[in-house]
């Protein structure tokens, strides 16, 4: 749903014998890079599953939707899409599943109309803080990006740099305040353990945030207060145990929000009482009738909406002198 789509128009393919030819000249209006399929009518170029190791240099100037999926790009250097004349029409760029492990500063510079970028399913061990902002200025020129899709970009454990993966991603999102206009951000399936507390406050235009299939345990230090335009918040398949009053109040205060909370290991003890009360009253949670307890054992699979305060107890904490080892 997030990838650039194209209409079913006729595609022209370049001949295989041109595979090694790289034109240093500006591309002809109807030229199609080797190993790609092009449709000028659909303004679409597809270079899919061709084991390309670099971005073709001779992309046609008309390209609006560019698929470079299923390749072996490894590194996206600065100005990877800079052309003369520039690719002024390029609006949707899909680089998913292309074995990218490094995206350098300024990789997406000189794409004035780039609206949607999908880097999903790449093991991004090194995402430059300036990958999206293009410069290390404290305030960069605004990026035209409206949708940024970064699902499953976490590299294998042994390939991670000696730093927080969450921190690396957030640094790229916040650098130079270039993404102030971002409206959709997908960060699903990235093993996130936490959400750095400053990230949401600095992306005030977000309408859609997908954090599903991560390992978030708590939202206690996350504030949604500034995300007044948020329309969907996907938190399915995390490790959430309970949502506390502050979070509940913030979510309820967002006028257009829809929240998705399925498949979290909810702990149905006395700390869950406020959330259960809220769930019974709110309309913002989609599929709220599907939410069930995971713990304690005696509550497993009970439906949250069917619980009452008598069900939600906490075992008394014994004074230290009575505790056993």
């Amino acid at each position: 749903s997030s990838s650039p789509t194209s209409s079913a128009s006729s595609f022209s393919s370049s001949a295989p014998f041109l595979a090694s030819a790289v034109s240093a000249q500006p591309p002809l209006p109807d030229q199609c890079p080797a190993l790609c399929e092009c449709s000028e009518a659909a303004r679409t170029v597809k270079c899919v599953n061709r084991n390309l190791t670099e971005v073709p240099t001779d992309l046609p100037a008309y390209v609006r939707n560019l698929f470079l999926t299923g390749n072996q790009l490894a590194v996206l250097p600065a100005g990877a899409f800079a052309r003369r004349p520039p690719l002024a029409e390029l609006a949707a760029l899909n680089l998913s599943g292309s074995r990218l492990d490094e995206v350098r500063a300024g990789a997406f510079e000189h794409l004035p109309s780039l609206r949607q970028l999908d880097l999903s399913h790449n093991p991004l061990a090194d995402l430059s803080p300036f990958a999206f902002s293009g410069s290390n200025a404290s305030v960069s020129a605004p990026s035209p990006l409206v949708e940024l899709i970064l699902n499953h970009i976490v590299p294998p454990e042994d390939e991670r740099q000696n730093r927080s993966f969450e921190g690396m991603v957030v640094a790229a999102l916040l650098a130079g305040r270039a993404l102030q206009g971002l409206r959709r951000l997908e960060l699903a399936s990235n093993h996130f353990l936490y959400l750095p507390r400053d990230v949401l406050a600095q992306l005030p235009s977000l309408r859609h945030l997908d954090l599903s299939n991560n390992s978030l345990v708590s939202l206690t230090y996350v504030s949604f207060r500034n995300l007044t335009h948020l329309e969907s918040l996907h938190l399915e398949d995390n490790a959430l145990k309970v949502l506390h009053n502050g979070t509940l109040a913030e979510l309820q205060g967002l006028p257009h929000i829809r929240v998705f909370l399925d498949n979290n290991p909810w702990v149905c003890d006395c700390h869950m009482a406020d959330m259960v009360t809220w769930l019974k009253e709110t309309e913002v949670v989609q599929g709220k009738d599907r939410l069930t307890c995971a713990y304690p054992e005696k509550m497993r699979n009970r439906v949250l909406l069917e619980l009452n305060s008598a069900d939600l107890d906490c075992d008394p904490i014994l004074p230290p002198s009575l505790q056993t080892s």
Epitope: R183, T228, E231, P255, E283, Q286
Partner: antibody
């Protein structure tokens, strides 16, 4: 590519009923609100209301509450605007648009109500 | 309902001119303001959202500013294709009202 395609122009008599449609494609239809906007001949834009197709929650402008019904069928990615009894004053161009922020618009449906 | 008042209602200008259109809300609307452009016989098109963010693909000669109740749309150097009607819209509270429009005509 995100597209909203609206049903064709309609000519109706006062008192008749009408349901016009708006079909979304190129995005996850259930995750975005869909709004309706009226533009009477030679006039400005009027916000009528919005619906969330995922759960059919609809919000109306007081000016249109009770006059029209906004609905959606998520199985076919389509939103609807309907009247049970048209008036001559309902004549105008009706647009659907995506999201609370109207970032994509349909091409419009011209509704003419005349005896 | 929040009322939005645009001024002027119509405006004559020449290619190359700098043009400013204002939108005043009857109460504070935070950053929940957008600007749209509509040409005759066409659907409106989003230009600016959240007061000052330029919609992707919109030329940089368009800009938005303001806060609270007073907002402006500026076209730094008018081009022939900019002659159209412009609307502001608030989405801070229901109903999400539009301004009455500003018609920009060739002088």
């Amino acid at each position: 590519e995100v597209q909203l395609v609206q049903s064709g122009a309609e000519v109706k008599k006062p008192g008749e009923s009408l349901k016009i449609s708006c079909k979304g494609s190129g995005y996850r239809f259930t995750s975005y609100w869909i709004g309706w906007v009226r533009q009477m001949p030679g006039k400005g834009l009027e916000w009528m209301g919005i619906i969330y197709p995922g759960d059919s929650d609809a919000r109306y402008s007081p000016s249109f509450q009770g006059q029209v019904t906004i609905s959606a069928d998520k199985s076919i990615s389509t939103a609807y605007l309907q009247w049970s009894s048209l008036k001559a004053s309902d004549t105008g161009m009706y647009y659907c648009a995506r999201s609370v922020l109207f970032d994509y618009w349909g091409q419009g449906t011209l509704v003419t109500v005349s005896s | 309902a929040i009322q939005l008042t645009q001024s002027p209602s119509s405006l004559s200008a020449s290619v190359g001119d700098r043009v400013t259109i204002t939108c005043r809300a009857s109460q504070g609307i935070s950053s929940a303001l957008a600007w749209y452009q509509q040409k005759p016989g066409k659907a409106p098109k989003l230009l600016i959202y959240d007061v000052s963010n330029l919609e992707s693909g919109v030329p940089s000669r368009f800009s938005g500013s303001g806060s609270g109740t007073d907002f402006t749309l500026t076209i730094s150097s008018l081009q022939p294709e900019d002659f159209a009607t412009y609307y502001c819209q608030q989405f801070n509270s229901y109903p999400h009202t539009f301004g009455q429009g500003t018609k920009l005509e060739i002088k």
